[in-house]
């Protein structure tokens, strides 16, 4: 009779994580008598996966009844596969011996590759807000996928971005991989409602990529423009002055009125109006008693937006018998959001 051969017909097997891998092995002879063992890897550091003779291998089941003497099918199934199970598996025939069984012949090996889905991409933006025209960086991370080949794209409001750098780690062979990408985005005043999307495509996703998103509302600060206007006389000795705070985001904003440099009133924006682009408008009124002033009055609307240095706009109020409507239309830059009318 020909000498026993151990046949592993599959050079490689590809299995999705969580599924069961079948590793096939047959022997061409019943002799010599002795157990079959399965190992992952070769050499002295090889890992025992299954021993026909003894041991407890809860994830391994045999395809046929290995207790039977006439059995020559030594195929096994390994359940609940994870990327850590990837490697080359060897079916090895031993002959009975003492004190240990003696390795007789090994199969050629079957490489088990595990397809593992990437984790949901996590997109994170800068720690601090930035203003329009500035460039900010967003990062996208996804982990635990295999094989290594993966595609990552960036989008802003559906438009693909091109300014990004991507790394897949580790560079060498591994049971699973991670991807890290950094994209640069130039902010515009219209970006309050914008989204940045990181899209990951992988063979395990069957054409349905995973997406991670970041809202630019978390990143952008649109500073307000200020306009101080003198309204027509409301009463014989009173002048109504308004400060219009326009196009700011986020809403956090504090306004202070100064009369000739002295604080007259401070208020916080609460009831604001929202613009279509997501920015806010707010207006504050100041009623000035002209009779209390003998000289001209310098009124200043000072706005502190989202913790930034204050910006201001001034208006000179002429004290005369018949005050005329006067106005000032100079814009002041800053970032903020919210609106309330104050009387």
């Amino acid at each position: 009779e020909e000498e026993l051969q151990v046949i592993q017909p599959d050079k490689s097997v590809l299995v999705a994580a969580g599924e069961t891998a079948t590793l096939r092995c047959t022997a061409t002879s019943l002799i010599p008598v002795g157990p079959i063992q399965w190992f992952r890897g070769a050499g002295p550091g090889r890992e025992l996966i299954y021993n026909q003779k003894e041991g407890h291998f809860p994830r391994v089941t045999t395809v046929s009844d290995l207790t039977k003497r006439n059995n020559m099918d030594f195929s096994i199934r390994i359940g609940n596969i994870t990327p850590a199970d990837a490697g080359t598996y060897y079916c090895v025939k031993f002959r009975k011996g003492s004190p240990d069984d003696v390795e007789f012949k090994s199969g050629a090996g079957t490489e088990l590759s595990v397809r593992a889905k990437p984790s949901a991409p996590v997109v994170s933006g800068p720690a601090a807000r930035a203003t329009p025209q500035h460039t900010v960086s967003f990062t996208c991370e996804s982990h635990g996928f295999s094989p290594r080949d993966i595609t990552l794209k960036w989008f802003k409001n559906g438009n693909e971005l091109s300014d990004f750098q991507t790394n897949v780690d580790p560079v060498g062979e591994s049971v699973s991989y991670s991807i890290h990408s950094t994209a640069k985005v130039v902010l515009t005043r219209e970006d309050v409602h914008s989204q940045v999307i990181c899209e990951v495509a992988h063979v395990t996703l069957q054409g349905d990529p995973l997406r991670g998103t970041a809202n630019l509302s978390e990143t952008i600060r649109v500073p307000p423009t200020l306009e101080v206007t003198q309204q027509p006389v409301r009463a014989e000795n009173q002048v109504n002055v308004t400060c219009q705070v326009r196009k700011f985001y986020p809403q956090r904003l504090q306004l202070t009125w100064l009369e000739n440099g002295n604080v007259s009133r401070t208020e916080t924006a609460s009831t604001v109006t929202e613009n279509k682009d997501g920015t806010y408008n707010w207006m504050s009124w100041l009623l000035v008693n002209v009779s209390a002033h003998r000289d001209d009055v310098k009124l200043t609307c000072q706005v502190e937006h989202d913790g930034q240095p204050a910006v201001s706009k001034s208006h000179d109020l002429k004290v005369s018998a018949h005050p005329k409507e006067q106005g000032s239309n100079t814009a002041a830059e800053n970032t903020g959001s919210n609106e309330r009318n104050i009387y």
Epitope: E1, S29, I31, V33, P35, K68, R69, K96, G97, S98
Partner: antibody, heavy 118, light 107 residues
Framework: EVQLVESGGDLIQPGGSLRLSCAAS????????MHWVRQTTGKGLEWVSA???????YYPGSVKGRFTISRENAKNSLYLQMNSLRAGDTAVYYC????????????WGQGTVVTVSS | DIQMTQSPSSLSASVGDRVTITCRAS??????LAWFQQKPGRAPKSLIF???RLQSGVPSKFSGSGSGTDFSLTISSLQPEDFATYYC?????????FGQGTKLEIK
């Protein structure tokens, strides 16, 4: 049903010959190692011979050169040819199947009695 | 040849008892050891192979352990049908050899 049935046991004179048979049924006979084991009256068990699936044969020193084990797979039969019999060969002879992957005996026949006496 | 020594040679016990029979090999036999049960006028019946694995159909009250040279057979709760003679056998090396037997008798 897996079964082994021995036959051929007899009363024989010292120096004589005898051929024992074991008929196997219920399993793929050619795929199993087969063994003969004997038990002397009031004594323990003694392994007598083995034949592998490839026809390889094994004997203990006590019977080597006198006993010959053989198999006929087409007939699902195992044989033990016993020559130059001695009084010490008197025993119940069992055939047994090396039925497990490691050749542990899993099935035994009911035995056949061989008596060597003048 | 490898010598197999069983102890005790005989043992008296009662129904419900737990009993252990030991078997020692004269040299290391790995764990290729079998246990058999034999009742008067009957063929031996296989109980355990590879020192600790139960043959198909054998109740779990029988258990085997050991490796190398020292082995044991334990019957956890004796029933009337368990009173018989028990043999160990090594089948690592030819010639395969048996222990001399342990006769388990009812007390």
């Amino acid at each position: 049903e897996v079964q082994l049935v021995e036959s051929g046991g007899d009363l024989i004179q010292p120096g004589g010959s005898l051929r024992l048979s074991c008929a196997a049924s219920g399993f793929s006979f050619s795929s199993y190692d087969m063994h003969w084991v004997r038990q002397t009256t009031g004594k323990g068990l003694e392994w007598v011979s083995a034949i592998g699936t490839a026809g390889d044969t094994y004997y203990p020193g006590s019977v080597k050169g006198r006993f010959t084990i053989s198999r006929e797979n087409a007939k699902n039969s195992l044989y033990l040819q016993m020559n130059s019999l001695r009084a010490g060969d008197t025993a119940v002879y069992y055939c047994a199947r090396g039925g497990n992957w490691d050749d542990a005996f899993d099935i035994w026949g009911q035995g056949t009695v061989v008596t060597v006496s003048s | 040849d490898i010598q197999m020594t069983q102890s005790p040679s005989s043992l008296s016990a009662s129904v419900g008892d737990r009993v252990t029979i030991t078997c020692r090999a004269s040299q290391d036999i790995n764990n290729y050891l079998a246990w058999f049960q034999q009742k008067p006028g009957r063929a031996p019946k296989s109980l355990i192979f590879t020192a600790s694995r139960l043959q198909s159909g054998v109740p779990s009250k029988f258990s085997g352990s050991g490796s190398g040279t020292d082995f044991s057979l334990t019957i956890s709760s004796l029933q009337p049908e368990d009173f018989a003679t028990y043999y160990c056998q090594q089948y690592t090396f030819y010639p395969y050899t048996f222990g001399q037997g342990t006769k388990l008798e009812i007390k």
